[in-house]
């Protein structure tokens, strides 16, 4: 004759307030004859949760039909879970006896605990922009989860980061917990289109972690490089000078030309293009009139990027005698 085993497969059952919890219990033998009851807790103070034969248990239903002669499944469902329902639940086999049934064997128990999903992680970046090669900090916060065990990972694009610190509060027992993590990220010049991702894994999420993201475009300032060149071709009595402002971000940029220290008010042609990495290029053309009185012309292209200190590049104009001689020529 096979010895009776009481199988409660889940050691821990996480449930959410208001939902229905299923407590599993199966037996391996129909003998000895007698009922299976459910209790919360152990010892003389244990609370009867379900007895098929007697009592009123409005929130409890059975998974299987217990009236069937060969039934071996004594699982129950408890509806409308509240915080008061937490505890360890035991299914207990009784042997039929007289005048009363005698406890024969107990299952190992299933601990019912309230599980609460973490809120969607919120990632916040630095208040001010920083240039490449510097380190910036991002924080990630998620709240309201239970139990306390939680895993948090940081990624920059697809690559996991290791430089971060995480705290879960409170340290003691609580209905719900919060997590806060701060990651340090080194900015690369091509990070305009990059993201930092905070990933939170918790038992209530069934293996589908929550993610919060922040765009590094909000945190990075890529300073421009400047180049001023004189075009070899002359347009009538004018020389074309180009100021190329390359690889900057964000787009906010002010460009001014000055001739021998005097700021030029006249309009110049310009184009703005976006690079593949999200940075910008700005090209400005400046036409300088050539005349005999203009021997030493120094042109300065000055750029103020994103409220930073202005940077400038100078060019001493090379006007050959031949060009001066031709400067009065009519242009077609």
């Amino acid at each position: 004759e096979e010895e009776l085993q009481m199988i409660q497969p889940e050691k821990l059952l996480l449930v959410t307030v208001g939902k229905t919890a299923t407590l599993h219990c199966t037996v391996t033998s129909l003998l000895p004859v007698g009922p299976v009851l459910w209790f919360r807790g152990v010892g003389p103070g244990r609370e009867l949760i379900y007895n098929q034969k007697e009592g009123h248990f409005p929130r409890v239903t059975t998974v299987s039909d217990l009236t069937k002669r060969n039934n071996m499944d004594f699982s129950i469902r408890i509806s409308s879970i509240t915080p008061a329902d937490v505890g360890t639940y035991y299914c207990v086999k009784f042997r039929k006896g007289s005048p009363e049934n005698v406890e024969f064997k107990s299952g190992p128990g299933t601990e019912m605990a309230l599980g609460a999903k973490p809120s969607a992680p919120v990632v916040l970046g630095p208040a001010a922009r920083t240039t490449p090669e510097h380190t910036v900090s991002f924080t990630c916060e998620s709240h309201g989860f239970s139990p306390r065990d939680i895993t948090l990972k940081w990624f920059k694009n697809g690559n996991e980061l290791s430089d971060f610190q995480t705290n879960v509060d409170p340290t003691g027992q609580s209905v719900a917990y919060s997590i806060r993590s701060t990651a340090r990220v080194v900015l690369d010049p091509w990070d305009v289109r990059s993201q930092v991702i905070c990933e939170v894994a918790h038992v209530t999420l069934q293996g589908d972690p929550l993610r919060g993201t922040a765009n590094l475009s909000e945190a990075i300032r890529v300073p421009p490089t400047l180049e001023v060149t004189q075009q070899p071709m002359r347009v009538g009595n004018q020389v074309n000078v180009t100021c190329q402002v390359r690889k900057f971000y964000p787009q906010s940029l002010q460009l001014t030309w000055s001739e021998n220290g005097n700021v030029c008010q006249r309009e110049t042609a310009s184009t703005l293009t976006e690079n593949k990495d999200g940075t910008y290029n700005w090209t400005s053309w400046f036409l300088v009139n050539i005349s005999d009185q203009r021997d030493d012309v120094v042109l300065t292209c000055q750029v103020k990027h994103d409220g930073q200190l202005a940077v400038s590049k100078r060019l001493a104009l090379e006007v050959t005698v031949h060009q001066k001689d031709q400067s009065s020529d009519a242009t077609p």
Epitope: P189, W190, R193, T273, E274, N275, K276, D277, G278
Partner: antibody
Framework: QVQLVQSGAEVKKPGASVKVSCKAS????????INWVRQAPGQGLEWMGW????????GYAQKLQGRVTMTRDTSTSTVYMELSSLRSEDTAVYYC???????????????????WGQGTLVTVSS | DIQMTQSPSSLSASVGDRVTITCRAS??????LGWYQQKPGKAPKLLIY???NLQSGVPSRFSGSGSGTDFTLTISSLQPEDFATYYC?????????FGGGTKVEIK
């Protein structure tokens, strides 16, 4: 499935221009950059440049600057590559190729080319 | 421009052989490297991206390794359909450049 279908073979005289088309299907046209690569007979692969079909931004190989122009027509999901002032050394098979989407890992922000057109043979001969 | 040097330029091998092709960059390119297979009259096909990641649909006998300047493409057990020309390509800097190619022929 992703497909890039190019226009047919062309024979051109030196000094002329050629315009090769590349029609994309099976994916969101504006999400992926298109690159052009050419291959002279019996030779290796030479990159010509890229185009962003969403913004119209382009980047060309220095060697071809001033001779190559890439344009697009978003209504037909087609990218065009025009090469002017043709010379005999431009004789090659011209491929359009979709650039694999991904984060930038360098300032070029280029990525490998995951889908290619069937190629268009352009012959430059007097 | 970044020069990509492939070796050998050609090799003869038999079905079932383990084949290794190397590619060297003239400067550090991190892991911004792809490997392509090209058969006569056909367009190149991407096999490996980011030096070691297998492109979707590519058999697992192809693998890539390396970082910085030295990279390797390995075919663990050569199959009849693998006889082709293989190119490496850097995507670290403009212009994107390819190696000269390695022709894998039947021994």
């Amino acid at each position: 499935q992703v497909q890039l279908v190019q226009s047919g073979a062309e024979v051109k005289k030196p000094g002329a221009s050629v315009k090769v088309s590349c029609k994309a299907s099976g994916y969101t046209f504006t999400r992926y950059d298109i690159n052009w690569v050419r291959q002279a007979p019996g030779q290796g692969l030479e990159w010509m440049g890229w185009m962003n079909p969403n913004s119209g931004n382009t980047g060309y190989a220095q060697k071809l600057q001033g001779r190559v122009t890439m344009t697009r027509d978003t209504s037909t999901s087609t990218v065009y590559m025009e090469l002017s002032s043709l010379r005999s050394e431009d004789t090659a098979v011209y491929y359009c190729a979709r650039e694999r989407v991904g984060y930038c890992s360098s300032t070029s922000c280029l990525h490998p080319l995951d889908y290619w057109g069937q190629g268009t043979l352009v012959t430059v001969s007097s | 421009d970044i020069q990509m040097t492939q070796s050998p330029s050609s090799l003869s091998a038999s079905v079932g052989d383990r084949v290794t092709i190397t590619c060297r960059a003239s400067q550090g390119i991190r892991n911004d490297l792809g490997w392509y297979q090209q058969k006569p009259g056909k367009a190149p096909k991407l096999l490996i991206y980011s030096a070691s990641n297998l492109q979707s649909g590519v058999p697992s006998r192809f693998s890539g390794s390396g970082s910085g300047t030295d990279f390797t493409l390995t075919i663990s057990s050569l199959q009849p359909e693998d006889f082709a020309t293989y190119y490496c390509q850097q995507s670290y800097d403009v212009p994107l450049t390819f190696g000269g190619g390695t022709k894998v022929e039947i021994k």
